[in-house]
């Protein structure tokens, strides 16, 4: 229904604290270098405004659109141009077009310094001190650095972090109790933040529709029992919720979310047996769980896909009646059967179903032509089941570490003038996959693996599309997002490149690697990992292991001396031709 | 909403030809294959003939075959079926349908052959 004041509708729904917190995140994404104390003095302003809305729907400016009020807050800020160079150019347009340049300019690798954690004794001093604003840096540091972070579980985030440091910050040794707590949420968020990210990409790039096949999918191998009808209004309410936050329009997302959360919870007995738990928590935890909720079981009693889909005389008829429709239907069918498979693949079975049908249907005999169609799909099921066997084998024979290096390996033989930090992060979070994934039952190994290996591989692509430097990326990252993972996958030693030549100051270390935290020391020994690669695209796995294990021991030995300065000094140069003649 | 309607039909002496047409709306023509069906009273369906989207590949029912004719006009999203010596035996309801269906999506085009 139309609301005479948008702003105080959503300020009722939300309440003061959501609201505050949505709002800091919406600017805190869209101009991500100004400070924490900017952000919340322009946060304090809105939210007095909307008060006043509240108290007087027609007072002035109460009628207008969020757009139009968070854009002209932001283009009131001092020095915009300066700050932000043409972003400025932004506010010289009107709404809906300001809106639509500001989100343009959303910077996915902003070059802000990493958010160092505070020592847990200063943490809770300011976390005591003053709650709402030590979180309210949070919202601010995490939405600056990821600028599609889903704001609504963004403030579950916060929650959690919440939560984390009351309970440490009582405890006598706060530093064991917050660093493993405080570390798990963070990886969980990042996960969150890529995978949202990539939810993004398939709604600017590929549209609603895209999403919406994602969508139908995804529910239909959580809800199995839940019919098509009830399975497409999920769908096109979470499209909507998505559509909402990828856009910038984050109170009308967390309000739409909470609305979606509290449907499912009314209809349960129409959508899963598993929602019991998660509708008896609170909002954002309800919704969280909402979110990743176990699989119901699936019906025992469905009958063979081919039925309706490939025996069935009406197949043609049936689909020139309604393509969305009954390829929806397909998706929905196969989807629920197989809760094993990634909704990437689904997707994939999806889009080659359609393809037969688009062939054979125009075809005088179309059932002998689809007739084998099923048969056709196992060539694209097992591609990604040997995936999930090779790198899991792999995984377990390396462990974490080692594994990174052979995917860091790899993906510089395949992609060779990408930048070595970019190769290097992309590296360290699809190896990542091998803890998060391999140590899952068989039945959840390749969902887990190849989605969350799609959206790592989406960043690879966002951050390339910056600066393009590799045909095999610009390649893969141009097709349709289901395709990439395989086409990245396929991928082999890029024959054009011309190696780099060999400087040895890329390969000298100085005695303070010896006191960095251990994540540091490893991303030190993969750039240097990284950088031989493309100085030798064709050494073998032998020569770089004997490479990597003599500066491994260099680092050992050098670091254990009694002057450091001087092991480094001497040592190191003599590493450095070990290397060359290693690789020669 | 997809809508085929059959027209053409009618009483005739067995030797003698009609021209039956399908026009088609609703959905994408060239897309589909085309087939006629026919039920005879008191009987099942029968297929009859089939043409694909372009119009370059044809097939028929031995019973038919050398004396029934199956075409199409994408500009105008028509199916034609022209009958040559006709019998009694192909005294039948006329159904024209997409891909390989075999259900009746029309109203049908009733064809009588007989002396």
């Known amino acids: 229904e139309a609301h005479k004041s948008e702003i105080a509708h959503r300020y009722n729904d939300l309440g003061e604290q959501h609201f505050k917190g949505l709002v800091l995140i919406a600017f805190s994404q869209y101009l991500q270098k100004c400070s924490y104390d900017e952000h919340a003095k322009l946060v304090q302003e809105v939210t007095d405004f909307a008060k006043t809305c509240v108290a007087d729907e027609s007072a002035a400016n109460c009628d207008k659109s969020l757009h139009t009020l968070f854009g002209d807050k932001l283009c009131a800020i001092p020095n915009l141009r300066e700050n932000y160079g043409e972003l400025a150019d932004c506010c010289t347009k009107q709404e809906p077009e300001r809106n639509e340049c500001f989100l343009q300019h959303k910077d996915d690798n902003p070059s802000l310094p990493p958010f160092e954690r505070p020592e847990a004794e200063a943490m809770c001093t300011s976390f005591k001190e003053n709650p709402t604003t030590f979180m309210g840096h949070y919202l601010h540091e995490v939405a600056r650095r990821h600028p599609y972070f889903y704001a609504p579980e963004l403030l579950y985030y916060a929650e959690q972090y919440n939560e984390i440091l009351t309970q440490c910050c009582a405890e006598a040794d706060k530093e064991s109790c917050l660093t493993p707590k405080l570390d798990g949420v963070k990886e969980k968020a990042l996960v969150s933040s890529v995978r949202q990210r990539m939810k993004c990409s398939s709604m600017q790039k590929f549209g609603e529709r895209a999403f919406k096949a994602w969508a139908v999918a995804r529910l239909s191998q959580t809800f199995p029992n839940a019919d098509f009808a009830e399975i497409t209004k999920l769908a096109t309410d979470l499209t909507k919720v998505n559509k909402e936050c990828c856009h910038g329009d984050l109170l009308e997302c967390a309000d739409d979310r909470a609305e979606l959360a509290k449907y499912m919870c009314e209809n349960q007995a129409t959508i899963s047996s598993k929602l019991q738990t998660c509708c008896d928590k609170p909002l954002l935890k309800k919704a969280h769980c909402l979110s990743e909720v176990e699989h119901d079981t699936m019906p025992a009693d469905l009958p063979a896909i081919a039925a309706d889909f490939v025996e069935d005389q009406e197949v043609c008829k049936n689909y020139a009646e309604a393509k969305d429709v009954f390829l929806g239907t397909f998706l929905y069918e196969y989807s629920r059967r197989h809760p094993d498979y990634s909704v990437s693949l689904l997707l994939r079975l999806a889009k080659k179903y359609e393809a037969t049908l688009e062939k054979c249907c125009a075809e005088a005999n179309p059932p002998a032509c689809y007739g084998t169609v099923l048969a056709e799909f196992q060539p694209l099921v097992e591609e990604p089941k040997n995936l999930v066997k090779t790198n899991c084998d792999l995984y377990e024979k390396l462990g974490e570490y080692g594994f990174q290096n052979a995917i860091l390996v790899r993906y510089t033989q395949k992609a060779p003038q990408v930048s070595t930090p970019t190769l290097v992060e992309a590296a360290r979070n699809l190896g990542r996959v091998g803890t998060k994934c391999c140590t899952l039952p068989e039945d959840q190994r390749l969902p887990c693996v190849e989605d969350y290996l799609s959206a790592i591989l989406n960043r690879v692509c966002l951050l390339h599309e910056k600066t393009p430097v590799s045909e095999h990326v610009t390649k893969c990252c141009s097709g349709s997002l289901v395709e990439r993972r395989p086409c990245f996958s396929a991928l082999t030693v890029d024959e054009t490149y011309v190696p780099k030549e060999f400087k040895a100051e890329t390969f000298t270390f100085h005695s303070d690697i010896c006191t960095l935290p251990e994540k540091e020391k490893q991303i030190k020994k993969q750039t240097a990992l990284a950088e031989l690669v493309k100085h030798k695209p064709k050494a073998t796995a032998e020569q770089l292991k004997t490479v990597m294990d003599d500066f491994a021991q260099f680092l050992d030995t050098c670091c254990k001396a009694a002057d450091k300065d001087t092991c480094f000094s001497t040592e190191g140069p003599n590493l450095v031709t070990r290397c060359k003649d290693a690789l020669a | 909403d997809v809508q085929l309607v059959e027209s053409g039909g009618g009483v005739v002496q067995p030797g003698n030809s009609l021209r039956l047409s399908c026009a088609a709306s609703?959905?994408?023509?060239?897309?589909?294959?085309m087939s006629w069906v026919r039920q005879a009273p008191g009987k099942g369906l029968e297929w009859v003939s089939s043409i694909s989207g372009s119009g370059s590949d044809t097939l028929y029912a031995d019973s038919v075959k050398g004396r029934f004719t199956i075409s199409r006009d994408n500009a105008k999203t028509t199916l034609y079926l022209q009958m040559n010596s006709l019998r009694p035996e192909d005294t039948a309801t006329y159904y024209c349908?997409?891909?390989?269906?075999?259900?009746?999506s029309g109203q049908g085009t009733l064809v009588t052959v007989s002396s």
């Open positions: 349908t997409i891909g390989g269906s075999l259900s009746r």
């Open positions: 609703g959905f994408t023509f060239t897309s589909f294959g």
